[in-house]
């Protein structure tokens, strides 16, 4: 922490400026008023301040402001943005998209990814849902960053929004979280005819259960082998040998390469080796021929 | 050790039908899809389509699919793609290919010797 | 489908030149590309697999290289025995596509 001293009236301050550059860690403790700091926000990312000074900065902000910045300050951050953390985000309340995008901007190029999806995910809340022009925002100045939120938080997306999303915007969604969007997909491209709905819905799909996945089956899709890699492995293991061919049309070829990763493993050890056999790729591990296969959870579930 | 024969030359006529075999040895034959690639004179190789030789379910490519037909012998390891509709920018000689499934898709390992097809009146 | 730009379709370089061929994919292909030697009369010959990885006994003269939809073959030093046509080939995508393919005389 920094020493308290008395400022020099020499030093003392009533604007921030260019001048502020050349003091001292303990100058600027002792001579930086909060409020004007705060009231002057706007000035700070223009001086070219060391990360030193900026952690003075901050300190003054932090204690001016225990219960976190007002968004005031908030939006004229700039790089003094790089000294939060989530913590220090966490307490913020932040409704302006303008805001957003001013910190996006600078978090750009920098290891701050569990800062940002704090900050998106103050936004969601400050706004009450994940609206289009959030969804917008997120997407033109942070690709990849709506899989930061919570699952809990992709749940206010509305199914109208869902057509804002592109497919990059997803490469990094978990399970969970496409659980959640799946859903609101499938309702917002109910309408669309077979090959366009497939198009739009696949970036999806690692969250659509067992029997839409056999219904994409029926629909002549040809599902490009990594999407379907990235379908839930519970979804993919009920599948039958005949349903994954038409599922994949050409794309069946590529299994011989991900033999050995899941989901195409674990479904594998489920299969017929007879029906995988019909697939002309040697894929090896099946069930014997003439082997009875009992399900014991069944009987376990009955007892 | 790994071998396509394929089989030989052919004179058509247009609109004829041609039927080239392809007899695989060295390998488990219904183990590796059969693909077919043709070069006409003065032109680069063509991706014809593909044959999965354990159920026969064969894939073309769009240029080709109202005219080809890709079938297969399991009991002689013997593919074979047969074009109708003959006519004269189909003189090319046509090649069966085995994929090598080391990564994506599998790139073409081995080649059979190709087969020239000339169509003249 | 995935469509494969070759260029140049020809060239004319001495022997010990250095030769660049380059194919441009109609989208990213992650590296799925390799690279085959076609001579009049014969199969072709597969050079180099993955955009980089050289065929066992392909002479280390051959190489490949690129990401993403460019990708450059090059031989670093020609030979007369090189003489051929040399074809790209995307198998990133299962409807395979060769590129139109460069031919390649000594001056």
């Known amino acids: 922490d920094v020493e308290r001293t008395t400022c020099p009236p020499e030093k003392e301050v009533h604007e921030i400026d260019e001048s502020l550059i050349f003091y001292k860690k303990r100058e600027l403790e002792a001579c930086v008023d909060a409020a004007l700091l705060a009231a002057q926000m706007d000035r700070v990312d223009a001086i070219p301040f060391t990360y030193e000074q900026l952690d003075v900065l901050k300190h003054k902000l932090d204690e001016l402001y225990p219960q976190g910045y007002p968004e005031s300050v908030i939006r004229h951050l700039g790089h003094l943005f790089l000294k939060m953390s989530p913590e220090d985000i966490r307490k913020w309340n932040v409704t302006s998209l303008e805001t957003l995008k001013a910190l996006l901007k600078v978090s750009k190029g920098h290891e701050m990814s569990a800062q940002v999806a704090t900050l998106i995910d103050r936004v969601v809340v400050g706004r009450g849902q994940l609206d289009k022009d959030t969804v917008d925002t997120l997407t033109a100045f942070c690709p990849g960053c709506l899989c930061s939120l919570s699952p809990e938080r992709l749940s206010s997306v509305p199914p109208s929004v869902i057509g804002a999303v592109r497919p990059q915007d997803l490469d990094t969604c978990g399970p969970r979280q496409l659980d959640v969007l799946y859903p609101k997909a499938r309702l917002a491209f109910q309408n669309m005819s077979g090959s366009e709905y497939f198009v739009k819905i696949r970036p999806f799909l690692g969250g659509a259960p067992t029997e839409d996945v056999k219904a994409l089956s029926q629909q002549n899709v040809s599902m490009d082998l990594a999407t379907f890699m990235k379908l839930r492995r519970e979804a993919v293991l009920p599948l039958t040998v005949a349903e994954v061919q038409k599922l994949l049309g050409p794309h069946v070829e590529g299994l011989k390469v991900e033999e050995q990763h899941s989901p195409v493993r674990d479904w594998i050890l489920k299969q017929r080796q007879d029906d995988l056999d019909t697939l002309g790729l040697g894929l090896q591990g099946g069930i014997p021929n003439g082997y009875l296969i009992l399900d014991l959870s069944v009987r376990e579930a009955l007892s | 050790e790994v071998q396509l024969v394929q089989s030989g030359a052919e004179v058509k006529k247009p609109g004829a039908s041609v039927k080239v075999s392809c007899k695989a040895s060295?390998?488990?034959?219904?183990?590796?899809?059969m693909h077919w690639v043709r070069q006409a004179p003065g032109q680069g190789l063509e991706w014809m389509g593909n044959?999965?030789?354990?159920?026969?379910?064969?894939y073309y490519n769009e240029r080709f699919r109202s005219r080809v037909t890709m079938t297969v012998d399991k009991s002689t390891s013997t593919a074979y793609m047969e074009l109708s509709s003959l006519r004269s920018e189909d003189t090319a000689v046509y090649y069966c290919?085995?994929?090598?499934?080391?990564?994506?898709?599998?790139?073409?390992?081995?080649w059979g010797q190709g087969t020239t097809v000339t169509v003249s009146s | 489908d995935i469509q494969m730009t070759q260029s140049p379709s020809s060239l004319s370089a001495s022997v010990g030149d250095r030769v660049t061929i380059t194919c441009k994919a109609s989208?990213?292909?992650?590296?799925?590309i390799a690279w085959y030697q076609h001579k009049p009369g014969k199969a072709p010959k597969l050079l180099i697999h993955?955009?980089?990885e050289l065929q066992p006994g392909v002479p280390s003269r051959f190489s490949g290289s690129g990401s993403g939809r460019d990708y450059t073959f090059t031989i670093s030093s020609l030979q007369p025995e090189d003489i051929a046509t040399y074809y790209c080939?995307?198998?990133?995508?299962?409807?395979?596509?060769f590129g139109g393919g460069t031919k390649v005389e000594i001056k």
């Open positions: 993955y955009t980089s």
């Open positions: 290919a085995r994929p090598y499934y080391g990564s994506s898709y599998g790139y073409f390992d081995y």
């Open positions: 989208q990213d292909i992650n590296k799925y």
């Open positions: 060295g390998y488990t034959f219904t183990n590796y899809w």
């Open positions: 044959i999965n030789p354990s159920n026969g379910g064969p």
């Open positions: 080939l995307q198998y990133a995508n299962p409807l395979r596509t």
